[in-house]
């Protein structure tokens, strides 16, 4: 699982790109996306 | 090697419903989440629906929301459509597509036609 | 509102660079995005992910003959070397979720054609 912690010190990713690979986990892990 | 076969088109009057299946196979089918896409004849592609893994969640445009249900069967290993109040402008070819962790529609089955008119 | 434009058609030579274009619209232009072969009677293909730096990732089975590349709100498909079997349509495509909801949209598709 990839952490929101990981994602947002991804650096030079657009915010758009991290909310595409939050997206992506929550259709598999059924996190709330709130 | 994933392999998804859609069935369930054919030839259907306005107004009128129908549902398509995804049959999954070669893959985790309860892991993914799933989505159809459909594209009208000689046209581009049309995104339509996406489900979670578990089906707890689901997303649709607004050209087919409140008239299209996505579902799943992840004991049957079946992806569902269920369409109703059918339009000339719903015919296409209908796709199932799995996502990976890196992309929404990585694997695309080979689609089914519906085809609306009286 | 979100929108990728693509050109209709492009041709070129057998064994040519064919480099295709996808333009995300303007407040948009850090968007990845990802691309999509349909060649002649077969259902669609994922080809890549393309991200704003330019890198990307490719899918199961696409040779390195495609690359992917960024600048500003293009986004470019790069196939080198080109083969016959590399005539097809080549779809962008980006999504995002906004306030709980998801929307994915497709730009209208390049006719690729190889002379």
């Known amino acids: 699982a990839v952490s929101e912690h990981q994602l947002l010190h991804d650096k030079g990713k657009s915010i758009q790109d991290l909310r595409r690979r939050f997206f992506l986990h929550h259709l598999i892990a059924e996190i709330h996306t709130a | 090697q994933v392999q998804l076969v859609e069935s369930g088109g054919g030839v259907v009057q306005p107004g009128r419903s129908l549902r398509l299946s995804c049959a999954a196979s070669g893959f985790t089918f309860s892991s993914y989440g799933m989505s159809w896409v459909r594209q009208a004849p000689g046209k581009g592609l049309e995104w339509v629906a996406t489900i979670s893994s578990g089906g707890s969640y689901t997303y649709y445009p607004d050209s087919v929301k409140g008239r299209f249900t996505i579902s799943r069967d992840n004991s049957k290993n079946t992806l569902y459509l269920q369409m109703n109040s059918l339009r000339a402008e719903d015919t296409a070819v209908y796709y199932c597509a799995r996502q990976t962790t890196m992309t929404y529609f990585a694997y695309w089955g080979q689609g089914t036609l519906v085809t609306v008119s009286s | 509102q979100l929108v990728l434009t693509q050109s209709s058609s492009a041709s070129f030579s057998l064994g040519a660079s064919a480099k295709l274009t996808c333009t995300l619209s303007?407040?948009?232009?850090?968007?990845?995005i990802e691309w999509y072969q349909q060649q002649p009677l077969k259902p669609p293909k994922y080809v890549m992910d393309l991200k704003q730096d330019g890198s990307h990732s490719t899918g199961d089975g696409i040779p390195d003959r495609f690359s992917g590349s960024s600048s500003g709100a293009e986004r470019y498909l790069t196939i080198s070397s080109l083969q016959s079997e590399d005539e097809a349509d080549y779809y962008c495509?980006?999504?995002?979720?906004?306030?709980?909801?998801?929307?994915?949209?497709f730009g209208g598709g390049t006719k690729l054609t190889v002379l």
């Open positions: 303007s407040q948009h232009s850090t968007y990845t």
């Open positions: 495509g980006v999504g995002d979720t906004i306030k709980e909801q998801f929307v994915y949209v």
